[in-house]
Amino acid sequence: LIIGFGISGRHSITVTTVASAGNIGEDGILSCTFEPDIKLSDIVIQWLKEGVLGLVHEFKEGKDELSEQDEMFRGRTAVFADQVIVGNASLRLKNVQLTDAGTYKCYIITSKGKGNANLEYKTGAFSMPEVNVDYNASSETLRCEAPRWFPQPTVVWASQVDQGANFSEVSNTSFELNSENVTMKVVSVLYNVTINNTYSCMIENDIAKATGDIKVTESEIKRRSHLQLLNSKAS
């Protein structure tokens, strides 16, 4: 969490941002809140990016003001216009690109004063893994697949029964470049699997950590997956 305060002259207002991560090719949100004002026409929101000459987005006098917008953000940004009055300056970002990563500034002017806060935005690719029993294999084998990751993640297997065991000798992981030549498909195979056990396939890079669990018994197979972003720090 980054909390910024205004500059001298006028009164300062508190602006708060949260560091976040964007998934390449998907839509993202850059979070920013501020002390609200009673008049929408008195609120100015400016989003800036370090190293970019034009603005990322500007909202003032109750509408988007895009004459100074940098071309790399054209047609890709919007604020939640109906929530500005309650202090939400968060920015929607369409079709997140690798090059969108960097330091952003959320700069606010209201009738109460000015304030700003920086936000670190990471970009990459992350997806939920799915673990299945590989019935084509000669021995009991599990196959963990996740369609989109970047940068290249690490893959670690674990099991409930053999806690702390190192499965690197009995697993094989491969990374296959996807058609857009940035993200990769992750495939990891675990051999010599025993029944009545829960196995976890953990995929992690510096942006996200995802886990796919599978419990195999004689009567059923249960699966569960979850994904966690690693860098959500508020400012």
């Epitope: 090719g25 004459s67 890709r76």
Partner: antibody, heavy 121, light 107 residues
């Protein structure tokens, strides 16, 4: 509700400049929040996006036409215009003006009724 | 540029039929896809935006689905008024591009 109407000559000579205007009624271009686009459709063919403009004057053009296209806006008349230079018979098409749904979602609605421009000597 | 490929190019169907039109993008466009209906001599009419959101005033027999590169427009029960040409359009990235169209004609 917002309505759009294209106007301009239906016949243009080769090598000349095609000029069309889109008049917006039922809403103000200056209210912001929307990009205003030009789209064309060759006879019996599909649709081609030409470019767009924001009320403040910032534009984006389809790279395939960029060297020949100029889109401008006149907020006092609530109009935006298209100029396409050095036209050939390949520019014969129905030209539509349209509004995007928002600054981030550019599905087009509403559209003008379209105007046929024929390039011929 | 992102290429949009529609199939089939022509579709013959009868009133009451369930009709499905497919649109494929040359690269992922997330959910940034719109569908239009066009009748001869008229401007296209927006039916669906953001892949599955029904435009106000459009009958509920029209629905859209898909994300990434594969999308479908479904007409659950074809009505006489639905015989027209349908186009998909991506607004994920500039320049915006349209599919080649699917003409739905009477069988």
């Amino acid at each position: 509700q917002v309505q759009l109407q294209e106007s301009g000559p239906g016949l243009v000579k080769p090598s000349q400049t095609l000029s069309l205007t889109c008049t917006v009624s039922g809403g103000s271009i200056s209210s912001g929040g929307y990009y205003w686009s030009w789209i064309r459709q060759h006879p019996g063919k599909g649709l081609e996006w030409i470019g767009n403009i924001y009320y403040s004057g910032s534009t984006y053009y389809n790279p395939s036409l960029k060297s020949r296209v100029t889109i401008s806006v006149d907020t006092s008349k609530n109009q935006f215009s298209l100029k396409l230079s050095s036209v050939t018979a390949a520019d014969t098409a129905v030209y539509y003006c349209a509004r995007g749904l928002s600054t981030i979602d550019e599905a087009f609605d509403p559209w003008g009724q379209g105007t046929l421009v024929t390039v011929s000597s | 540029d992102i290429q949009m490929t529609q199939s089939p190019s022509t579709l013959s169907a009868s009133v009451g039929d369930r009709v499905t039109i497919t649109c494929r993008a040359s690269q992922s466009i997330s959910s940034w896809l719109a569908w239009y209906q066009q009748k001869p001599g008229k401007a296209p009419k927006l039916l669906i935006y953001k892949a599955s959101s029904l435009e106000s005033g459009v009958p509920s027999r029209f629905s859209g689905s898909g994300s990434g590169t594969e999308f479908t427009l479904t007409i659950s029960s074809l009505q006489p008024d639905d015989f027209a040409t349908y186009y998909c359009q991506q607004d994920n990235s500039y320049p915006y591009t349209f599919g080649g169209g699917t003409k739905v004609e009477i069988k």
